[in-house]
């Protein structure tokens, strides 16, 4: 029950996180005009990964897309790539995790397969979250660097007569959305990995127990291994116990719900 809850919660948290990563990627407010010196501005600038916008006090807003690919800063391209990779991995992770959910029965899918899928989706969510956090952090670092550079030459003048005020940019709402969303996706991924361990506990190393029946000694080994007779190879009396449809050369064998000792 706890495993199902952990898996379900991990899925929901990751879903919210990935929705947040998508929202952050699409948002225009990655960087917003710094209003420290002028809290009421007549023209307000803000920028996203895909376009830059200007909002006037009149309410008129105009956005312009970055219609160039080669002319954009490499850092911006890197951030775009990280966010897209994060979304793609997250989306695949969500798709995989839907089929991995314990509460959803798909044919005769084994718990071992569900465990593997849960682990796969968990890893995908972790990488997705890390991509988003990395992307947002790279952009934030870029902003901090530019902020202090523009502060250093805030006013450039012609003989001190005419002042050109440089527009400084600070953290936009999308950065915080991205950080939180990335964190949630990461947490969701970790929860999925924890749930995977619960779905697939390591094999219990029981000692082989001998049941002495009249005539023949049958050694019974749990966990899907073939039991053999105690003495010689009397095939007539050989019992095969296989809890599932697994082969005997599997590295690790997981007991199914039918496996009882």
């Amino acid at each position: 029950m706890a495993v199902t809850a952990c898996q379900g919660l991990g899925f929901v948290v990751s879903l919210i996180g990935i929705a947040g990563i998508i929202a952050a990627t699409c948002m225009d407010q990655w960087s917003t005009q710094d209003l420290y010196n002028n809290p009421v501005t007549a023209v307000f600038n803000y920028q996203g990964l895909w376009r830059s916008c200007v909002r006037e006090s009149s309410g008129f807003t105009e956005c312009r897309g970055y219609f160039t690919l080669l002319g954009l800063p490499a850092m911006l391209q890197a951030v775009r790539a990280l966010m897209i990779v994060g979304i793609v991995l997250g989306a695949i992770g969500l798709l995989v995790s839907i089929f991995a959910l314990k509460c959803i029965r798909i044919g005769s899918m084994e718990d071992s397969a569900k465990a593997n899928m849960t682990l796969t989706s968990g890893i995908m969510f972790i990488v997705s979250g890390l991509c988003a956090i990395a992307g947002v952090s790279v952009f934030a670092n870029m902003l901090v660097t530019n902020f202090w550079m523009s502060t250093a030459n805030m006013y450039t003048g012609m003989g001190g007569m005419v002042q050109t005020v440089q527009t400084r940019y600070t953290f936009g709402a999308a950065l915080f959305v991205g950080w939180v969303a990335g964190g949630l996706t990461l947490i969701g991924g970790v929860m999925m990995c924890i749930a995977c361990r619960g779905l697939a506990p390591e094999e219990t190393n029981y000692k082989a127990v001998s049941y002495h029946a009249s005539g023949h000694s049958v050694a019974y080994k749990p966990g899907g291994f073939k039991a053999s007779t105690g003495f010689g190879s009397n095939t007539k009396n050989k019992k095969i116990y296989d809890g599932g449809a697994r082969t005997e050369d599997e590295v690790q064998s997981y007991p199914s719900k039918h496996d009882y000792v």
């Epitope: 005009q33 002028n38 009421v40 501005t41 007549a42 023209v43 600038n45 803000y46 920028q47 830059s52 916008c53 200007v54 006037e56 006090s57 009149s58 309410g59 008129f60 105009e62 312009r64 005419v162 002042q163 050109t164 005020v165 440089q166 527009t167």
Partner: antibody, heavy 118, light 113 residues
Framework: QIQLVQSGPELKKPGETVRISCKAS????????MQWVQKMPGKGLKWIGW????????NFAEDFKGRFAFSLETSARIAYLQISNIKNEDMATYFC???????????WGQGTSVTVSS | DIVMTQSPSSLTVTVGEKVTMSCKSS????????????LTWYQQKPGQPPKLLIY???TRESGVPDRFTGSGSETDFTLTISSLQAEDLAVYYC?????????FGGGTNLEIK
């Protein structure tokens, strides 16, 4: 069509309070800010300030902070300019103007003349 | 505050003549975000409220005759009337629309000979 109609001329004694109204029609009142401008006889235009008709937040030029106040009657689509403790130097024509694209004053009221006489 | 300086303060011209008036700002009115200059021109005829002529330094307001042209960038702006008409007798004001307070220039008074 968009129209801004201001109240009639005012004659006030120093120290009194005057309230000028500006009734808007032809557009959604809360979608555009309202600005106020002072025109003194023989002088140029002076920007008093503006009020965000949606958030009701005012913004004044430094020279007009204190005795000047903006208010709104949103349901009636009216903006008000109130000048308290009126002085001789407040004698002017006051215009209301809609805040338009490019932070301009795209539509103007006809103006309200305020005379201060003891 | 941004200081707007207009020149000349008064101009006497004849009908049909080309007229140019200047407006200078103490700070750049160019917004880097959209590469627009937030400079507005108004025309005020005697006994009337001002009328919007040009915004964003060069964009003509609808209904304004094409003889009115705005130009310039950052701190230096010009309003040109290609062929003056009698009805253009007025005071012309430039205004900073970039930063609060939205300051006006002193005006250029256009008189007909």
């Amino acid at each position: 069509q968009i129209q801004l109609v201001q109240s009639g001329p005012e004659l006030k004694k120093p120290g009194e309070t005057v309230r000028i109204s500006c009734k808007a029609s032809g557009y959604t009142f809360t979608t555009a800010g309202m600005q106020w401008v002072q025109k003194m006889p023989g002088k140029g235009l002076k920007w008093i300030g503006w009020i965000n008709t949606h958030s009701r937040v005012p913004n004044f030029a430094e020279d007009f902070k204190g005795r000047f106040a903006f208010s709104l009657e949103t349901s009636a689509r009216i903006a008000y300019l109130q000048i308290s403790n009126i002085k001789n130097e407040d004698m002017a024509t006051y215009f209301c103007a809609r805040l338009g694209k490019g932070n301009t004053m795209d539509f103007w009221g006809q103006g309200t003349s305020v005379t201060v006489s003891s | 505050d941004i200081v707007m300086t207009q020149s000349p303060s008064s101009l006497t011209v004849t009908v049909g003549e080309k007229v140019t008036m200047s407006c200078k700002s103490s700070q750049s009115l160019l917004n880097s975000g959209n590469q627009k200059n937030y400079l507005t021109w108004y025309q005020q005829k005697p006994g009337q409220p001002p009328k919007l002529l040009i915004y964003w330094a060069s964009t003509r307001e609808s209904g304004v005759p094409d003889r009115f042209t705005g130009s310039g960038s950052e701190t230096d702006f010009t309003l040109t009337i290609s062929s003056l008409q009698a009805e253009d007798l007025a005071v012309y004001y430039c205004q900073n629309s970039y930063s609060f307070p939205l300051t006006f220039g002193g005006g250029t008074n256009l008189e007909i000979k």
